[in-house]
Interface confidence: medium
């Protein structure tokens, strides 16, 4: 005669794909201490067990190695451990205790396991700031992964120069030595759970700190089109009395501080403009000479100069003689 017992706890449990869940089971208190038998967990309806401690009974292919009967009759434990949960595991399960020496067995009530889509995503952590030319360790972690599951496979994707560091069951380290051109590019950590065939990823944009690499001056003369100077220029002819607007532009992250100096400044010189714009409303003799734009940045500075050469208006010269 079959004896029935109720599984303690909830009638259903939820687990995310690729993760683990413990189906609690306690052997009935009425079970005699002398009851020697084997335990079997079954998927409702199927007559091949999903887990057992019976050496003569083979379990289902689909659950082999993933479902384990945690058998400890002295502690009345008959719980079922499920790892690498798959969508197909979404079913009702029951436990059966059978003995070859006793006339009766014990069968539990049913418990439903609901397998949901994996919603957790990997975390990417960056210690401090990323500096161009300096190696940094980035960690991709999946702290919600259970230790007994099949270790996930970590993949990194980045245009920046990288090398793989140490990894654990729950994390992978990537050493990155970013370049200025890697700023604002994507870095992706992809985590695959081979036991369940599920892949999750997280993508971040790299924020790379770097000193200015390029500084340029755009020159606006009156109403004429602007032109750009990308390197130090010996002389730029300008007509006396003409309005001139000099616009300095530099890269670098975070943005460099731009300032204008007359002449070739010393480090502690006072700027004539604390922005990237220098307005010269009427060019005269006082403006003849060198103007320097300096791009200052915590990681290094860069400057560019241009030399103004003033052409005097012919009538102006005659009036002065």
């Amino acid at each position: 005669q079959e004896r029935r017992f109720q599984l303690e706890g909830p009638e259903s449990l939820t687990v995310q794909e690729g993760l683990c869940v413990l189906v609690p089971c306690r052997l009935p208190t009425t079970l005699p201490a002398s009851y020697y038998g084997y335990g079997y967990w079954f998927l409702e309806g199927a007559d091949v067990p999903v887990a057992t401690n019976d050496p003569d009974e083979e379990v289902q292919e689909e659950t082999r190695g993933r479902f384990h009967l945690l058998w400890d009759p002295r502690r009345k434990n008959c719980s079922l451990s499920i790892r690498d949960a798959r969508r197909r595991d979404n079913a009702a399960y029951f436990f059966r205790l059978k003995s070859k020496w006793m006339k009766y067995g014990y069968t539990s009530s049913k418990l439903s396991v609901r397998v949901m889509a994996l919603t957790h995503r990997p975390n990417i952590s960056i210690p401090g700031t990323l500096e161009s030319g300096h190696p940094s360790n980035l960690t991709c972690s999946v702290p919600w992964v259970c230790e007994q599951g099949t270790p996930p496979i970590f993949s990194w994707m980045s245009a920046a120069p990288t090398s793989l560091g140490p990894r654990t069951t729950q994390s992978s380290v990537l050493t990155i030595t970013p370049r200025p051109q890697d700023h604002s590019t994507n870095l992706t950590c992809q985590v695959t759970f081979p036991g369940a065939g599920v892949t999750m990823e997280r993508t971040i944009q790299l924020n790379v700190s770097y000193a200015p690499q390029k500084v340029a001056i755009s020159i606006f003369q009156g109403n004429s089109a602007a032109f750009k100077i990308l390197q130090n220029t010996s002389s730029l002819p300008v007509l006396e009395g003409q309005a001139l607007r000099l616009l300095c532009d530099a890269d670098g992250n975070p943005p460099a501080h731009l300032s204008w100096f007359q002449g070739f400044p010393a480090l502690n010189a006072t700027p004539i403009s604390n922005t990237g714009v220098l307005e010269l409303p009427q060019v005269g003799s006082a403006e003849e000479g060198d103007f320097t734009c300096r791009a200052q940045h915590p990681l290094g500075s860069l400057q560019i100069s241009l030399s103004l050469f003033v052409h005097w208006k012919p009538e102006g010269r005659a009036g002065g003689v």
Epitope: Q1, D47, E61, R64
Partner: antibody
Framework: EVQLQQSGPELVKPGASVKMSCKAS????????MHWVKQSHGKSLEWIGN????????SYNQKFKGKATLTVNKSSSTAYMELRSLTSEDSAVYYC??????????????WGQGTTLTVSS | DILLTQSPAILSVSPGERVSFSCRAS??????IHWYQQRTNGSPRLLIK???ESISGIPSRFSGSGSGTDFTLSINSVESEDIADYYC?????????FGGGTKLEIK
């Protein structure tokens, strides 16, 4: 749709052996043991035994030990039963069946169409 | 092994009549009994599981009752398509066993 397709009728001589097949479709073959049942002409049903497709592990009714041998081919989802040292007593219809095994009941929910075995000289 | 005795061996009824099949177990088996119908040259078909639980796709005129050692399958209004052999099966103890069957005939 679950289907169990059995091989055709067999006419064999006494003392010979015969091997019949049962091809399963419409479900995961390894989730269910394949059971075999004998029905002699005009008589009732007798459970012969079952086989676990995962490892070929078998369980036999004592009466059929030494008479029947159950095997499977997992890749083709096919179960086989070989009967040896045949006598006229073995003339019968043999069914393969899938057992629903639940927490509150177990019963044969799907049956093959049967293979008729005639043992005659 | 548990012995299942079905009676009578043959039942003869007129269409529309109510009919009952009996199945007796040699020892108490709770409600672990199942009923099958087998038409001529056909395979057994599950009618009732666990003594009284209905099966989807089976006409509602079929019902089951009983527990312990005595079980009954009833057809409340017999139709001509019900001509068949009826078997009970126990799943309480290994090995599973079947009753000897009852043949239903139409007068």
């Amino acid at each position: 749709e679950v289907q169990l397709q059995q091989s055709g009728p067999e006419l064999v001589k006494p003392g010979a052996s015969v091997k019949m097949s049962c091809k399963a479709s419409g479900y995961t073959f390894t989730d269910y043991k394949m059971h075999w049942v004998k029905q002699s002409h005009g008589k009732s049903l007798e459970w012969i035994g079952n086989i676990n497709p995962n490892n070929g592990g078998t369980s036999y009714n004592q009466k059929f030990k030494g008479k029947a041998t159950l095997t499977v081919n997992k890749s083709s989802s096919t179960a086989y039963m070989e009967l040896r040292s045949l006598t006229s007593e073995d003339s019968a219809v043999y069914y393969c069946a899938r057992r629903y095994y639940g927490s509150s009941s177990s019963y044969f929910d799907y049956w093959g169409q049967g293979t008729t075995l005639t043992v005659s000289s | 092994d548990i012995l299942l005795t079905q009676s009578p061996a043959i039942l003869s009824v007129s269409p529309g009549e109510r009919v009952s099949f009996s199945c007796r177990a040699s020892q108490s088996i709770g409600t672990s009994i199942h009923w099958y119908q087998q038409r001529t040259n056909g395979s057994p078909r599950l009618l009732i599981k666990y003594a009284s639980e209905s099966i989807s796709g089976i006409p509602s005129r079929f019902s089951g009752s009983g527990s312990g050692t005595d079980f009954t399958l009833s057809i409340n209004s017999v139709e001509s398509e019900d001509i068949a052999d009826y078997y009970c099966q126990q799943s309480n103890s290994w090995p599973t066993t079947f009753g000897g069957g009852t043949k239903l005939e139409i007068k």
